[in-house]
Every structure is written in C-alpha cells, then in structure tokens.
C-alpha cells in the first residue's frame, strides 16, 4: 500500500530571464527513494539515481542545473518554459510517487510565488 | 555530440589498450556514460556505465579487467591483459541505466587483439 | 541477474506488412526497456524508450507495448529502410548482470 504523499512548490511564477527552484519532497513512507525523474510535458529534464548521480539531458544542458537536493533549478527562463513540471520518485517498494508543478513565466516583474500544497 | 577519438586497431594480448570517448559541446558532470561493444557479426555487449558522480557498474564478465574513468569531457575504457575474444566494434552512448535509453552513440571503433 | 530473451532471431517481411518483436525478461523489469535499430557499419539508434514512448524524430509505424516481463515491438506499414536488426534492453537494474540487451532481432524485407 502506498502511504506516502508529495508536497510540491505549487502553483509558481518567475520573471522572463530570471531563474525558479522546482522542488517536490516525498513524506509519510519508509520507501527507499530510487530515482527522481524531472519531466515537462512528457520530456524528460533530469534525472537523479541513488547510485549514479544526477543526468541532465542534452537539449536542456544549458538552462537546467542539478538541486538544491532533489530539486531542480531552471535558468534563463523564456515564455515557452510556461506549463506543467512533474517530479517522479520512483520508490522501493511502494511504487511509483507523482508531483505536478505550474510555472507561469511572466514578461513583467509582476512574478509571485503561488501556495504550496499536497498532492496524494 | 558523442565522438570516439581513440583509433582502434591492431593490439597484442601483452597491450594495456585504451579507449576515450570526447563528448563535444558539453560537460560530462551531469551525464552518465556506457560503453558497449559488438563482436563482428554477433549482438551487442554492455561493459559498464560510470555515473555523474563518477560510480561505476560493470557487468559480470568486465569486472577486474575493464575499467571505466572520466574527466569533465572525456570517458575512457582501459582494457588490461586483452584477449582474442575481445576483438569487437566499441561503442560509448550517453545514459543507460533508467535515462530512458542511450543517446546518442558515437560512430564506434574497431579493436583487433591478435597475437 | 536479469536475461533478456529476444524472439525471434530473424523475421522476413514483405514491405507494407506488420512485423512484431518479442522481448522476455527473466524478472519483472517495470516498463525499464528500451528498444534500438542498428543497420550495418552504423551505431544502434534509440527508437522507443519506457516501453512504449516513441524518441524524437522515430516515425509513428513503430510502436512498443508491454508490462512486467513480456514486451512487444511492432512495425507496421513495414518499408524498405526498417532492414535492420532489433535490440531490447533493459534499464532495471545494473547489478549482476551479463548484458543490459536481447541478442537482437534481424528483419529483412523482401
């Protein structure tokens, strides 16, 4: 059965050019943490396995950086990186853990950080 | 972009033969890399896979005379004490290991062991 | 130690036909394959990934399905360029094993 639940940044905005902090944290399980993927819809970001480190993919190389920990950072953001984030936490043994996060980027300084909230 | 530098060739079984593999364009800091190899004629035969962190698997066969190391551009697949068997196409790709696949793979070299 | 069985070995097909490739692992492997075309003198190109999500650029007349441990890669509409030969590999697990790959699937078209 899985008990766990991932918090996740939420609902967030950040200014065109600037930089956002993608962050999920997996809670109430004991299941060993096997790998996180960072996808965007459907494309894969990132990835970070327990045993071999952190895997950035090659189209993203150049805007996307490893943590802090789990997370994962998005620079020289750009309009088109609007949309949903999902983190991916595969786990030993419960399975297979989701987190959505919706990036606005705003052409204005107008960029406020949305709530945080749970999904199960 | 994925290339192997190292030409193949010619080795004796007394070599200690090494191969690298250069990654243009970008760091290997955040990217895993495999190596493969394929005998003339035969299928494919994973080696090993070095992480960003620079952990290493290997397979079965490989462990203790097949090394993988790594530099911020370069991979590199040291073979001690070749044999005759290990006659093979070497290939390195980017991921393997749960990156959803491996890609994209440099063109491949061809290592000969004859004594 | 996961083995990857690969059937068959070699398949002919007429071109426009459907050609489907089996791939059985010895333990559940969680949708962790990937499958590649290789054509002679070349490196094997990534075609499909987590079992059945197409990679860039491949076109829509290769698809893969599968769970646990039974897999399937199928071409249909077969032409001409998908002479190659096939390869499963598994992404599960690293540990003990002998080889992440199928020992390959050769399609002729006639």
């Known amino acids: 059965m899985m008990t766990g639940t991932i918090e996740t940044t939420g609902n967030i905005s950040a200014e065109k050019g600037g930089s956002i902090i993608l962050q999920c944290h997996l809670s109430s399980t004991t299941a060993q943490v096997t790998q996180v993927n960072w996808e965007q819809q459907d494309q894969l970001l990132a990835i970070c396995n327990a045993d071999l480190g952190w895997h950035i993919y090659p189209a993203f190389k150049d805007r996307v950086a490893p943590g802090p920990g789990l997370g994962l950072t998005l620079q020289s953001l750009t309009v088109n990186d609007t949309g949903e984030y999902f983190c991916i936490y595969h786990t030993y043994p419960d399975g297979t853990y989701t987190g959505r996060i919706f990036l606005e980027v705003l052409e204005s300084s107008v960029a406020e950080h949305g709530a945080r909230f749970q999904i199960p | 972009q994925v290339q192997l530098e190292s030409e193949g060739g010619l080795f004796k079984p007394t070599d200690t033969l090494t191969l690298t593999c250069t990654v243009s364009g970008s760091s290997l800091s955040s990217s895993y890399m495999s190596w493969v190899r394929q005998a003339p004629g035969k299928g494919l035969e994973w080696i090993g896979i070095?992480?960003?962190?620079?952990n290493t698997y290997y397979a079965n066969w490989a462990k203790g005379r097949f090394t993988i190391s790594k530099t911020s551009t370069t991979v590199e697949l040291k073979i001690t004490s070749p044999t005759t068997e290990d006659t093979a196409t070497y290939f390195c790709?980017?991921?393997?290991?749960?990156?959803?696949?491996?890609?994209?793979w440099g063109p491949g070299t061809l290592v000969t062991v004859s004594s | 130690d996961i083995v990857m069985t690969q059937t068959p070995a070699s398949v002919e097909v007429a071109v426009g036909g459907t050609v489907t490739i089996k791939c059985q692992a010895s333990q559940s492997i969680s949708s962790y394959l990937n499958w590649y075309q290789q054509k002679p003198g070349q490196p094997p190109k990534l075609l499909i990934y987590?079992?059945?999500k197409l990679a860039s650029g491949v076109p829509s007349r290769f698809s893969g399905s599968g769970s646990g441990t039974e897999y399937t890669l199928t071409i249909s509409g077969v032409e001409s360029a998908d002479a190659a030969t096939y390869y499963c590999q598994q992404e599960h697990s690293v540990g003990n094993v002998d080889n992440v790959f199928g020992g390959g699937t050769e399609v002729v078209v006639k």
């Open positions: 987590d079992a059945l």
């Open positions: 790709a980017r991921g393997g290991y749960r990156t959803s696949g491996m890609d994209p």
């Open positions: 070095i992480g960003s962190n620079g």
